[in-house]
C-alpha cells in the first residue's frame, strides 16, 4: 500500500509521495535520495490502455489507473536505486551504491536442513508478529480516507506477514457500488488473467526482501513446495514445517506448531462488502486446514500429477484470448489451473496452482484468505519457479501478454495493485537469476537437477 | 560520542544464569540492532546473536539457542544478555556491538569494553 | 551455515613489510565481510566493512580485497601498533561467524 510517510492529509491532498531518504538539512530536503543522485519525484505512469468489457463500473474503484486516485507524483530511482525513496536496490543488487550483483537460491522445503527449517519457520513467526517498517495499510476508501472528520487518515501500521496477506485481500476485493447496492464480484486484479504469475512474483519478492531486512540476512529466501506429488497428503504439514493436523478438530492445525496460534486477518468479508470499508489489521480466527478432506469433491483430494508440470511445460503460448480463465492453450490458464495440465480449457477442471488451493481445503482453499495460510507462500514459490522455467525455455517471450484488452489490472503495462512503488506486469516477466537476483534448485521431471540459473 | 558500557565481571556457579547489560549512549538503540559476540579465554570471536530494540525481535546462532536470551529497555537505551544453565565452557569475555544497517553495512562498528564471567564452583 | 577459514593462523613480520591475511568463506558471500583488529586485552576494532572499505579513522596502509568466497585483508609497510588478533566477519547468511583469527607478531 503506501509509505507511512505519504499516508497523511498533506500527501494525500498534493497527491504527492516523494519520502526523503537522509533529510539531514529538514523536511523535504532529500525526496527519493535525490541529493545523492539515487532519485527523483516524477509524474505517475499509468496504463491507460482499455481494458476487457468484464468491468464494466469505470470510475468506481480506487484501484483504477493504480496509482493515481491516490497519488500522481512518485519516486523515479536511478541505476539500480529502488525502493518507495530510493534507499534500496532493485532485486538482485545489493550494497551502497547498489552496484554489486548477488544471486540468492529458493530451494525444495524438504531438502533443508533441521536448522533451515527452524530458522524459516521461527522467520515466518516473526513476521507474523513484527509491525512492517515502511507500509501502512488504508482502512476506508478513498472518498472516506480522511475520516469522519475529514482531519484524520484512515491507516493502519499491521505485521510483515499480514502485509502480504492484505495485499492479496485488496488485490482481489469486490468493487464497492454503493450503500444498498450489492458489490461487483466479477473483478479480480491479480488472478484470472495474464497479470497472475507477474503479480504473485512481485508478491513473494516483496515479503522475501521485507523479511530480509527484518532478519538482517539479505540471503534469506523462501523454500517452495513441490504440490506435485500426485498424493493424498500435505508432506509439508508437518510439525517440525507447516504444522500437522489437530487430533482434537481436523480442520486445525496441531497445537505443537507455531502456526496453530496464527489468527487471519480479512476474514469478514460481509462487513467490507456491505459497508464499504476495508479489511484491517484486526486478527480473528484461527487457521483452518484440512488437506484432502474435501469428501464431496473428489477431484480436490489429490495433489497434481508430477507429470502435470512437464505437461505444462510444454505450452508454448503464455496467453490468449480472451485473456481470462477460460482461455485455451495459455500457459498462464494452464498454470493457474483452470486449464486441463494439457492446456485445453475444462471448466470442470481444476489442476496445479488451483487444485493445491483446493487440496488444501480450509482458510488456503479461499481467494481472499488464502495467503493467511502460510503454506500460502510455498505453493507460490513453487508456482513462480514453473513460471520461471517457462521464462527460460521460451526466452522469456511477452508478445502473447496483451497490451490492452485484458481483465481490468491485468494489461502488460498496468501497475499491479496495491504495491508500492509503481511496479508494472513487464517489470517481472524476467527471468529470475538475470534479472531478479534470486534461482531455484529444482528438478522438473525427467531433467537433472539443477540451479536455475 | 557513541559508547557501549558493560556492566562489570561475574563469578557464578555452575548451573546458575546471569544477565549482563550493556548502555549505550551517543546513539538511539532503537536505530540499531545490538549484536553480542563471546571469547572463551585464549580463543577466536563466536557470535551469538542480535536483537531489534525497537520491536524485541532476536536471533541466535543455534548453539545459543536456548541458552542465550537478550532483551532491551529503550527507555534506558540498554541492552541484557541473560546465560542460563551455564558450565566451565562458558567462561569468557562477552561483548556487546552494534551494527549500523545503513544500505546494510557488513560490520559491527562499535564495541563494548566485554564483560568477564567466570563460571567455577 | 557458512564457514570461514582464515590463514594464516599467525605470522611473523617486521616493520615496513606487507603482509596478507585470507578468510575464504564455505560459500559466495557476496562481499558480506568486515576486518576487526584486536589488541590483547581490548575490544576488536572495526577496519573494513563490506569487503574493501576502511572504517573511518583507519590508517590507508590497510586495505580489504576480494570477491565471491575469497576476501584479503593486506597491511603495508607494517607499524608495531600492527601488533594484535585480526578477525574476519560474514554477514551473509545467519549464523554470522567469524574466522578463527590470525595472531600478528612484528619482529
Known amino acids: 500500500q503506501f509509505p507511512r510517510e505519504c499516508a497523511n492529509i498533506e500527501a494525500l491532498r498534493r497527491g504527492v509521495c516523494c519520502p526523503d531518504l537522509l533529510p539531514s538539512s529538514g523536511p523535504g530536503t532529500d525526496p527519493c535520495g535525490s541529493s545523492s543522485g539515487r532519485g527523483r519525484c516524477v509524474a505517475v505512469i499509468a496504463d491507460s490502455r482499455p481494458h476487457s468489457r468484464h468491468y464494466p463500473h469505470d470510475g468506481k474503484d480506487d484501484r483504477e489507473a493504480w496509482p493515481l486516485r491516490f497519488f500522481n507524483r512518485t519516486c523515479q530511482c536511478n541505476d539500480n536505486f529502488s525502493g518507495h525513496n530510493c534507499g534500496t536496490c532493485r532485486p538482485g543488487w545489493r550494497g551502497a551504491a547498489c552496484n554489486q550483483k548477488i544471486l540468492t537460491v529458493r530451494r525444495n522445503l524438504l531438502d533443508l536442513s533441521p536448522e533451515e527449517k527452524s530458522h524459516f519457520v521461527r522467520a515466518l513467526d516473526m513476521a507474523k508478529r513484527t509491525t512492517h517498517p515502511q507500509f501502512v495499510i488504508a482502512t476506508r476508501r478513498l472518498e472516506d480516507i480522511l475520516g469522519p472528520d475529514g482531519n484524520t487518515p484512515q491507516f493502519e501500521n499491521i505485521s510483515v506477514y499480514n502485509y502480504f496477506v492484505w495485499t492479496h485481500y485488496y488485490s482481489v476485493k469486490k468493487t464497492f457500488l454503493g450503500t444498498g447496492q450489492e458489490s461487483f464480484g466479477d473483478v479480480d486484479f491479480s488472478h484470472e488473467g495474464p497479470a497472475f504469475l507477474t503479480w504473485h512474483r512481485y508478491h513473494l519478492l516483496q515479503l522475501e526482501r521485507d523479511m530480509q531486512e527484518m532478519l538482517q540476512e539479505p540471503s534469506f529466501s523462501l523454500p517452495y513446495w513441490n504440490f506435485a506429488t500426485g498424493k493424498n497428503v500435505c508432506d509439508v504439514c508437518t510439525d517440525d514445517l507447516m504444522g500437522s493436523r489437530s487430533n482434537f478438530d481436523s480442520t486445525l492445525i496441531s497445537p505443537n506448531s507455531v502456526f496453530s496460534q496464527w489468527r487471519v486477518v480479512c476474514e469478514s468479508l460481509e462487513e467490507y462488502d456491505t459497508l464499504g470499508t476495508l479489511c484491517n489489521s484486526t486478527e480473528g480466527g484461527p487457521i483452518r486446514r484440512n488437506p484432502a478432506g474435501n469428501v464431496g469433491r473428489p477431484a480436490v483430494q489429490r495433489l497434481p500429477e508430477p507429470q502435470d508440470v512437464t505437461q505444462c511445460l510444454e505450452v508454448r503460448v503464455f496467453d490468449t484470448p480472451p485473456f481470462y480463465s477460460n482461455s485455451t492453450d495459455s500457459f498462464r490458464n494452464t498454470v493457474e489451473g483452470y486449464s486441463a495440465p494439457t492446456g485445453k480449457y475444462d471448466p470442470a477442471v481444476r489442476s496445479l496452482h488451483n487444485l493445491a488451493h483446493l487440496f488444501l481445503n480450509g482458510t488456503g482453499g479461499q481467494t481472499h484468505l488464502s495467503p493467511n495460510d502460510p503454506i500460502f507462500v510455498l505453493l507460490h514459490t513453487f508456482t513462480d519457479a514453473v513460471f520461471d522455467e517457462w521464462l527460460r525455455r521460451y526466452n522469456a517471450d511477452i508478445s502473447t501478454f496483451p497490451l490492452e484488452n485484458a481483465p481490468i489490472g491485468h494489461n502488460r503495462q498496468y501497475n499491479m495493485v496495491p504495491f508500492w512503488p509503481p511496479v508494472t506486469n513487464t517489470e517481472m516477466f524476467v527471468t529470475a537469476p538475470d534479472n531478479l537476483g534470486y534461482a531455484y534448485e529444482v528438478q522438473w521431471p525427467g531433467q537433472e537437477f539443477t540451479v536455475s540459473e | 560520542e557513541v559508547q557501549l558500557q558493560q556492566s562489570g565481571a561475574e563469578l557464578v556457579r555452575p548451573g546458575a544464569l546471569v544477565k549482563l547489560s550493556c548502555k549505550t549512549s551517543?546513539?538511539?538503540?532503537?536505530?540499531?540492532?545490538l549484536h553480542w559476540v563471546r571469547q572463551r579465554p585464549d580463543q577466536g570471536l563466536e557470535w551469538i546473536g542480535w536483537i531489534n530494540p525497537d520491536n524485541g525481535n532476536t536471533v541466535y546462532d543455534p548453539k545459543f539457542q536456548g541458552t542465550a536470551s537478550l532483551t532491551a529497555d529503550t527507555s534506558s537505551n540498554t541492552v541484557y544478555l541473560q546465560l542460563s544453565g551455564l558450565t566451565s565452557e562458558d567462561t569468557a569475555v562477552y561483548f556487546c556491538?552494534?551494527?549500523?544497517?545503513?544500505?546494510?553495512?557488513?560490520?559491527?562498528?562499535?564495541w563494548g569494553q566485554g564483560a568477564s564471567v567466570i563460571v567455577s564452583s | 551455515a557458512i564457514q570461514m577459514s582464515q590463514s594464516p593462523a599467525s605470522l611473523s613480520a617486521s616493520v615496513g613489510e606487507t603482509v596478507t591475511i585470507t578468510c575464504r568463506a564455505s560459500g559466495n558471500i557476496y562481499n558480506y565481510l568486515a576486518w576487526y583488529q584486536q589488541k590483547q586485552g581490548k575490544s576488536p576494532h572495526l577496519l573494513v566493512y563490506d569487503a574493501k572499505t576502511l572504517a573511518d579513522g583507519v590508517p590507508s596502509r590497510f586495505s580489504g580485497s576480494g570477491s565471491g568466497t575469497q576476501y584479503s585483508l593486506k597491511i603495508s609497510s607494517l607499524q608495531t601498533e600492527d601488533s594484535g588478533n585480526y578477525y574476519c566477519?560474514?554477514?551473509?547468511?545467519?549464523?554470522?561467524?567469524f574466522g578463527s583469527g590470525t595472531k600478528l607478531e612484528i619482529k
Open positions: 556491538t552494534r551494527r549500523d544497517y545503513t544500505y546494510e553495512k557488513a560490520a559491527l562498528d562499535y
Open positions: 566477519q560474514h554477514f551473509w547468511s545467519l549464523p554470522f561467524t
Open positions: 551517543g546513539f538511539n538503540i532503537k536505530d540499531y540492532f
